[in-house]
């Protein structure tokens, strides 16, 4: 047989025996004669041990480049490969020789007494013991003990090579302490040397620590840390601890090995190294090593040790937050200190709970931040063993984009009559202040949309061409007046207001605001109608279970067939930024009402009366009339509020007062409710009457007492009434020092 | 940098003896399992025996058992192998070898022991 | 033991060819399985653990794989310096074997 690839194109070796595999019997002599190209060396089994005086390799006589490989007198051990081969290659020939001696069937070990097989205990693991035969067609069978157990061949998995050996699964054998092989030849048994078997793992799976990070003591205190390693079954294991102190007086190493679930295919070993008062010197790295057979896993972790107990805060504590309304904010509390400190977070000096929207703890979590959460947040922390406190303040601003007030009447809105002046406004709220407001424009005609185009719902309108308002060629003249500051719902807002001088052509206007946080804008429908014309009969905001009238009104000459409509639910969401479809070109959104046709000398009017008005007849009335010439429509919209109906309220307490003879009192009673209360005073519960010295003004919103005296002191009471119940506010007005005696007395 | 210098190596008459020594630097010794491996002239590698860290346990390659002792001296860095009876079939270079992560990471350049008479 | 049958055990070859080397494992040593290289006069070199991961400072011409039993040891672009022998050796089980060797040689 031949192995190997030939470096360079040399002929393979040639044996004087033309076999792969050769069988002669014990005590005759072994003689092999090898020719080749150039030199030859011979390999032959045990070719290094002290057998070699018996084998003899000699150059041929006739010819160069020839050896002859002689052994006299074998012996079942000379079983094996015999190997010749060109030096410096591996272009070799080989023959397998059989010694066969059947008093020792099987090959003795160089080893004395024993062998040494390591298995694995593993099911897909075979195991191969080494007991080579000097005979190819022995039966072999293994037996193992103990308890004894013997193992045949099966065809299988468990099969003997004269060769190899005897192969078998590692874990049928791996309770045994020691197998051998056993051959049977004529009722005689012959058996192998015996092989001592060792179950080795070494697989180390993981080495964890613990604690594993953050360990922090003070001088004195007891270091404990922990050292799991975890491995496969049979593995034998050995820590080792890498420390800063080694000469260390108080140091303490247990290792032992883990209990675990029976069946477990893992073993558990720990280390616990104890340092019973730790000082400075053994802060720093803590390495623990696990080592097995063939394996070395390691883990570590940094030890901090302190002087004394402390707190501090960390030099990225943050003093200025800043957010948007809706964020999340996080506010860490960064600090240095040993033992953990205990944290408490305070606003505006009371405390914060932790609840669905905030969580206060190292870290203060405001879920989704709001206005009302602006203002200055304490983070104390106090050291659980000294008691010591440290605090920080940190100021949480929180910005709002622009928030145009008006956007929130999401309508169609009125339709301007021809030639009048308008003014138009944007009220605007945000943190900090817009920077700007800009107004823009635009005709109604490049923008609206036709019933045939496809409508978007993020885009009804195509209107692309924003003009500024500077630019009013083609549009109305246009004024915008300098931004106005207002306190409105006890909120700063700023109001920006266009003039349209002379309302001519219908268009489009934007008002855009910005701030450092964001935009917002509104887009109004102005609308110009020399069209019908509408009027509310008797007030532009009735209040609930009010009547109201809506009159449209028409030229007879110009216009026929007035209808009133009322705008029904949108067909599409409005989005920000967006109009609805204009709503003479879509009737589709219109419910039909019923009116009255009244006429006077030029006009028509149609009259739609809402008795008993209530909260659902809000919304948007649409006038149509049609042009009597060219039969277009022409809507006008007007937008009807119903104020609901409030029982009355008092603003602001009465101060119980002491004053002194002669000066005056002045106080104030605001009510509110609709419809409107009444206010009306009384003194110790008897109607006040107004003379020289009382005075009620605004309405009876303000009482004034001018020069008081003894009598005036009192029980006063405020009391508003409207259809919807009375409220009242009461006080008391002591008045001091002696009345002055008159000359009548 | 690791580095491992095996020494000790020499020619030894069959049945002698031997001790090889490995002066190990450039790591922390004590946690690491150590092995010497063997190379024949001309030939292949060979596992020769295995100590772990602290020297608990050890293993040897079946030809070499009862007659090659592994030992280890944490203190002086050094590992060991005490040759005895030797044979001519341990003739070969003997590397001292660390066991890492992933089994023998760093070898030495190894010494020769030549056993002949 | 496992036995780990390494071809070819030498292959003459020029630089910048590409260059495999293969170890076939009797039995699954799932793959923990390292590459060395010796170079005469030098200490052993690990240049793979793994199967596939390069130790550092090995260059990203050598790769390793694996397809079942089979071992891939990979040189994408042969340089002078890495003329030399290859082993390979499995973990898998103990005790640790080592393939019979790749001399690698200039062609």
């Known amino acids: 047989a031949s192995v190997g690839l030939p470096s360079v194109s040399l002929d393979l070796p040639r044996l004087s025996i033309q076999k792969d595999i050769l069988t002669i019997k014990a005590n005759t002599t072994l003689q092999i004669t090898c020719r080749g190209q150039r030199d030859l060396d011979w390999l032959w089994p045990n070719n290094q041990s002290g057998s070699e005086q018996r084998v003899e390799v000699t150059e041929c006589s006739d010819g160069l480049f020839c050896k002859t490989l002689t052994i006299p007198k074998v012996i079942g051990n000379d079983t094996g490969a015999y190997k010749c081969f060109y030096r410096e290659t591996d272009l070799a020939s080989v023959i397998y020789v059989y010694v066969q001696d059947y008093r020792s069937p099987f090959i003795a070990s160089v080893s004395d007494q024993h062998g040494v097989v390591y298995i694995t205990e593993n099911k897909n693991k075979t195991v191969v013991i080494p007991c080579l035969g000097s005979i190819s067609n022995l039966n072999v069978s293994l037996c193992a003990r103990y308890p004894e157990k013997r193992f045949v061949p099966d065809g299988n998995r468990i099969s003997w090579d004269s060769k190899k050996g005897f192969t078998i699964p590692s874990y049928m054998i791996s309770y045994a302490g020691m197998v051998f092989c056993e051959a049977k030849i004529n009722d005689e048994s012959y058996q192998s040397i015996m092989y001592i078997v060792v179950v080795v793992g070494y697989r180390i799976y993981d080495v964890v620590l613990s604690p594993s990070h953050g360990i922090e003591l003070s001088v004195g205190e007891k270091l404990v840390l922990n050292c799991t390693a975890r491995t496969e079954l049979n593995v034998g294991i050995d820590f080792n601890w890498e420390y800063p102190s080694s000469k260390h007086q108080h140091k303490k190493l247990v290792n032992r090995d883990l209990k675990t679930q029976s069946g477990s295919e893992m073993k558990k070993f720990l280390s616990t190294l104890t340092i019973d008062g730790v000082t400075r010197s053994d802060q720093g790295l803590y390495t623990c090593a696990a080592s097995s057979g063939l394996m070395t896993k390691k883990n570590s972790t940094f030890v901090r040790v302190h002087e004394k107990p402390f707190v501090a805060f960390g030099s990225g504590m943050e003093s200025l937050v800043e957010a948007t309304v809706g964020e999340r904010v996080r506010i860490p509390a960064k600090y240095l200190g040993y033992p953990p400190p205990e944290i408490k977070w305070y606003k505006n000096g009371i405390p914060l709970e932790s609840n669905h929207t905030i969580k206060a703890g190292h870290v203060l979590t405001i879920m989704e931040v709001s206005e009302r959460d602006t203002g200055n947040y304490t983070v104390i922390l106090t050291n659980p063993i000294s008691k010591e406190k440290q605090s920080h303040v940190v100021s949480l601003v929180v910005y709002v984009p622009p928030q145009i007030g008006e956007k929130s009447l999401i309508s169609p809105v009125d339709s301007y009559q021809y030639g009048t002046t308008q003014t138009l406004t944007c009220t605007v709220y945000a943190i900090p202040p817009p920077h700007h407001i800009h107004w823009y424009w635009q005709l109604e005609e490049e923008c609206a949309n036709e019933p045939s185009q496809a409508v978007s719902v993020t885009n009804p309108y195509p209107c692309e061409e924003w003009r500024s308002v500077e630019d009013f060629q083609g549009g109305n003249k246009i004024e915008v007046n300098k931004n106005q500051f207002a306190l409105i719902e006890g909120k700063n807002k700023t109001v920006s207001t266009l003039v349209i001088q002379a309302a001519n052509v219908s268009a489009l206007y934007k008002c855009e605001a910005v701030n450092k946080v964001g935009r917002g804008e509104r887009v109004i429908s102005f609308h110009v109608t020399r069209g019908p014309e509408i009027t509310l009969q008797p007030d532009m905001q009735p209040t609930e279970q009010e009547s109201v009238s809506l009159w449209c009104t028409a030229d007879r000459s110009t216009f026929e067939n007035l209808t009133w409509y009322k705008l029904g639910p949108q067909p599409l969401p409005i989005h920000v930024g967006e109009l609805p479809t204009p709503v003479c070109k879509n009737l589709d959104t219109l419910w039909k009402l019923n009116a009255t046709m009244f006429s006077n000398s030029t006009n028509d009017i149609l009259i739609m009366e809402l008795k008993n008005a209530s909260l659902q007849d809000q919304g948007d009335y649409v006038c149509l009339a049609q042009d009597r010439k060219t039969k277009k429509r022409h809507c006008v919209v007007r937008q009807l509020t119903v104020l609901e109906r409030v029982a009355p309220t008092i603003t602001g307490n009465l101060e119980n007062q002491t004053t002194s003879i002669g000066e005056s009192i002045e106080v104030s009673c605001t009510a509110s409710g609709n419809p409107p209360p009444q206010i009306m005073w009384f003194k110790d519960n008897e109607t006040l009457v107004e003379d020289s010295g009382i005075v009620l003004k605004d309405g009876n919103r303000n009482l004034t007492i001018r020069r008081v005296r003894k009598e005036d002191e009192g029980l006063y009471t405020c009391q508003a009434c409207s259809v919807l119940g009375c409220a009242k506010v009461e006080a008391f007005f002591i008045i001091e020092g002696a009345q002055e005696k008159t000359n009548l007395e | 940098e690791v580095q491992l210098v095996e020494s000790g190596g020499g020619l030894v008459q069959p049945g002698g003896s031997l001790r090889l020594s490995c002066a190990a630097s450039?790591?922390?010794?004590?946690?690491?399992?150590m092995s010497w491996v063997r190379q024949a002239p001309g030939k292949g590698l060979e596992w020769v025996a295995t100590?772990?860290?602290?020297?608990?346990?050890?293993y040897y390659v079946d030809s070499v058992k009862g007659r090659f002792t592994i030992s280890r001296d944490n203190a002086k860095n050094t590992l060991y192998l005490q040759m005895n009876s030797l044979r001519a079939e341990d003739t070969a270079v003997y590397y001292c070898v660390r066991i890492g992560e992933d089994a023998l990471d760093y070898w030495g350049q190894g010494t020769l022991v030549t056993v002949s008479s | 033991d496992i036995q780990m049958t390494q071809s070819p055990s030498s292959l003459s070859a020029s630089v910048g060819d590409r260059v495999t080397i293969t170890c076939r494992a009797s039995q699954d040593i799932a793959g923990s399985l390292n590459w060395l290289q010796q170079k005469p006069g030098k200490a052993i070199k690990r240049l793979i653990y793994?199967?596939?991961s390069l130790d550092s400072g090995v260059p990203k011409r050598f790769s390793g794989s694996r397809s079942g039993s089979d071992y891939t040891l990979t040189i994408s672009s042969l340089q002078p310096e890495d003329f030399a022998t290859y082993y390979c050796l499995q973990y898998g089980s103990f005790p640790p074997t080592f393939g019979q060797g790749t001399k690698v040689e200039i062609k």
């Open positions: 450039g790591f922390t010794f004590s946690s690491y399992g």
């Open positions: 793994a199967t596939s």
């Open positions: 100590i772990t860290s602290g020297g608990s346990y050890t």
